[in-house]
């Protein structure tokens, strides 16, 4: 009982005087207050709380429930207790069943004894099966059995509180164990994708999961410089303990090109924060940008091969492509294909496969590509190179000798003399006349010249060259002549092609 | 001891709009996530819409999508319903209940308010 | 959205009576289930939640059981104050959907 000073508030005393009190099932329960400032009783137990105005309270015929602490205050707020102890065999424990328990944390069972005398006050776990090895408890007969630092693993753990009576073992009834986790780490979060491509007017939808241990995760989108609220939508579920997953889709019903920006989905707990952004690109139209991968003018060499290649962005997506020459199109020889199968892919190739050209398939090779806003071309000038070909060597009437050779790039002309049997023709002529022709050809296709010279200038008999030749290689024709007396007969040509 | 009341039902025309409100004491009102339920007369429980304790995220049944939204003032300790574009489907008794944790049911539920949409 | 069915949509018991009250969902909730008891003119108490755990306050005569698809409610002997309907609810993901009810009534 407490000691009483002069002058000073006291609290109040009780009867009887003691702080624990037995007594058996059936009984009375009578206790008095004595303070000249009473105020009341208050029992608990567990979460009940009843109150007594009255300055002694009764219980004529106790029962299990009645075990719990008695509070006698006073109208300066000072208290003192007694804890009463109803024993009854057939009730051994009182119980509350819930049990949570937050991760690292402690948390109490709520078993407390109404007979404080039974021995070996502990925890068991359900159906004979042990509890965790590192399970820590302290037994406290008036409050429960304190769990030492929850673990997460034992969630769902079944447990009884038990007390060995008159030696035989008694269990309560089953307490789950609920674990409420510590956030550990920040939440996961992800995106749909990371960047969209719109035109005006088009929905833009974007959605962010975020995957954490609870429900409690915070999470919100935000545009990057900007206060507004965005217009969400979330669902959300749990895939099983400690495994909680959330939706949040944003949505814009009819995007605006000032809508363009970056957004943020930014989830925090108390562990820390996490954000993932998405970009949106919003364009008053469709668009395409075609980006040659060779240069744009070819020179190719005849019978060998070439592949035209271009790189171009399309958006919306393409919906006609064509190659064409000569305005005619192609059905084979070329292929088209994304860039990247990635689904925000806007980039494409395509690709014309020209084999073993021809001198005369030089010309304009045109690429065309559409969607549902533009139409874009590209122009390939492909030039064939070949090797110079005599087209006719003869001497004319003015006795000029006279040699027109045709190839691309635009052959040289060389005149030569080679005195009597010898085989070498050495000795350079100047020519008279050096023309380019224009070719009945197409465009592109082989230029054609001309060289002329006169043959009176020779007095000897022998062999006059006639050589042609560009980067791709060389031919040569030859004009036989020999003096009979002062009179030049026939001249035989013949032509020697030099690879 | 936990306490939910429910305000602002009463009778308004097809086409018209009502508040509601719920006001919660005893306890920490921004811990829990919160959700209106409703009971159409003689009919069972229809849960209507939820809000995150930190009024982050907001759920809704497809039933009133774009017409009702949650929100809450967790300084005022009060959760609302702005409920638009009302109809008479609409009708039914509101309640207001609180979220347990992570999937564990509604633990306490307001005495609930009628809205009743007639012309 | 998932789909709750209960059944039976109503039954007659007498005091004493073991009842069973069944739920299924229209796919798997996990163990995310709840169950509430409504009286006329009174708001919904919930009862059991987590499939299994009864909430506190609640008599031990209620039990819950079941997982995935299949939900059990059990009342093991009726007392004059069940006379009531019952819901079960699940909570494993949005939207949150109730079963149509069980009305348990006098026989």
């Known amino acids: 009982q407490p000691s009483v000073s002069p002058g000073e508030p006291s609290p109040p005393s009780i009867h009887p005087g003691k702080s624990d009190l037995i007594v058996r099932v059936g009984d009375e329960i009578r206790l008095l207050c004595t303070d000249p400032g009473f105020v009341k009783w208050t029992f608990e137990i567990l979460d009940e709380t009843n109150e007594n105005k009255q300055n002694e309270w009764i219980t004529e015929k106790a029962e299990a429930t009645n075990t719990g602490k008695y509070t006698c205050t006073n109208k300066h707020g000072l208290s003192n207790s007694i804890y009463v102890f109803v024993r009854d065999p057939a009730k051994l424990f009182l119980v509350d069943r819930s049990l949570y328990g937050k991760e690292d944390n402690d948390t109490l069972v709520r078993c407390p004894l109404t007979d404080p005398e039974v021995t070996n006050y502990s925890l068991k776990g359900c159906q004979g099966k042990p509890l965790p090895k590192d399970l820590r408890f302290i037994p406290d007969p008036k409050a429960g059995i304190m769990i030492k630092s929850v673990k997460r693993a034992y969630h769902r753990l079944c447990l009884h509180c038990s007390v060995d009576q008159e030696g035989k073992s008694v269990l309560s009834e089953k307490f789950i164990l609920k674990v409420r986790p510590a956030f550990k780490a920040v939440p996961v979060v992800s995106v749909s994708k990371a960047s969209y491509l719109l035109r005006e007017g088009e929905e833009f939808t974007v959605t962010c999961t975020i995957k954490d241990v609870s429900s409690s995760v915070y999470s919100t989108w935000k545009r990057e410089n900007s206060q507004t609220k965005l217009q969400e939508k979330y669902n959300s579920w749990h895939h099983g303990d400690f495994n909680y997953e959330r939706q949040a889709t944003l949505t814009i019903s009819s995007a605006r090109v000032n809508d363009s920006g970056v957004f943020m989905c930014y989830a925090n707990n108390t562990f820390g924060s996490a954000n993932v952004t998405t970009t949106l690109e919003v364009v008053d139209k469709g668009f395409i940008n075609i980006f040659p991968m060779i240069n744009t003018t070819v020179f190719v060499n005849d019978g060998e091969n070439v592949d035209l290649i271009v790189e171009y962005e399309a958006f919306p997506k393409p919906e006609h492509q064509q190659w064409i020459y000569m305005n005619r199109t192609f059905t084979d020889k070329w292929e088209d294909y994304p860039k990247s199968e990635n689904e925000s892919n806007i980039r494409y190739v395509s690709e014309l496969h020209l084999t073993r050209l021809k001198g005369t398939e030089g010309g304009t090779y045109t690429f065309l590509v559409s969607n549902s806003d533009v139409n874009a071309a590209i122009a390939f000038n492909v030039y064939v190179n070949t090797k110079p070909e005599i087209l006719t060597y003869d001497r004319l009437v003015n006795g000029m000798l006279q040699c027109v050779a045709a190839g691309f790039p635009e052959p040289t002309i060389d005149w030569y003399f080679c005195p009597g049997t010898e085989q070498r023709c050495s000795a350079s002529v100047l020519p008279v006349d050096v023309q380019t022709l224009n070719s009945s050809g197409p465009p592109f296709g082989k230029l054609v010249v001309q060289s002329s010279i006169d043959s009176s200038a020779f007095k000897h008999n022998g062999t006059v060259e006639c050589k042609a030749y560009n980067d791709v290689g060389k031919t040569s024709a030859y004009f036989n002549f020999a003096f009979k007396g002062n009179n030049k007969e026939q001249i035989h040509p013949h032509t020697l092609f030099t690879p | 001891e936990v306490q939910l009341l429910e305000s602002g039902g009463g009778l308004v025309q097809p086409g018209g709009s009502l508040r509601l409100s719920c006001a919660a004491s005893?306890?920490?009102?921004?811990?829990?996530?919160m959700s209106w339920v409703r009971q159409a007369p003689g009919k069972g429980l229809e849960w209507v819409s939820a809000?995150?304790?930190?009024?982050?995220?907001?759920y809704y049944a497809d039933s009133v999508k774009g017409r009702f939204t949650i929100s809450r003032d967790n300084s005022k300790n009060t959760l609302y319903l702005q409920m638009n574009s009302l109809r008479a489907e609409d009708t039914a008794v509101y309640y207001c209940?609180?979220?347990?944790?992570?999937?564990?049911?509604?633990?306490?539920w307001g005495q609930g308010t009628l809205v009743t949409v007639s012309s | 959205d998932i789909q709750m069915t209960q059944s039976p949509s109503s039954l007659s018991a007498s005091v004493g009576d073991r009842v069973t009250i069944t739920c299924r969902a229209s796919?798997?909730?996990?163990?995310?289930l709840n169950w509430y008891q409504q009286k006329p003119g009174k708001a919904p108490k919930l009862l059991i939640y987590?499939?299994?755990t009864l909430q506190r306050g609640v008599p031990s005569r209620f039990s819950g059981s079941g997982s995935g698809t299949d939900f059990t409610l059990t009342i093991s002997s009726l007392q004059p104050e069940d006379f009531a309907t019952y819901y079960c609810?699940?909570?494993?993901?949005?939207?949150?959907?109730f079963g149509g009810g069980t009305k348990v009534e006098i026989k």
């Open positions: 209940a609180r979220g347990a944790y992570d999937g564990e049911g509604f633990d306490y």
């Open positions: 005893g306890f920490t009102f921004s811990d829990y996530p």
């Open positions: 809000i995150g304790g930190s009024g982050g995220d907001t």
């Open positions: 796919q798997t909730i996990s163990g995310y």
């Open positions: 987590d499939a299994s």
């Open positions: 609810q699940q909570n494993y993901r949005t939207p949150f959907t």
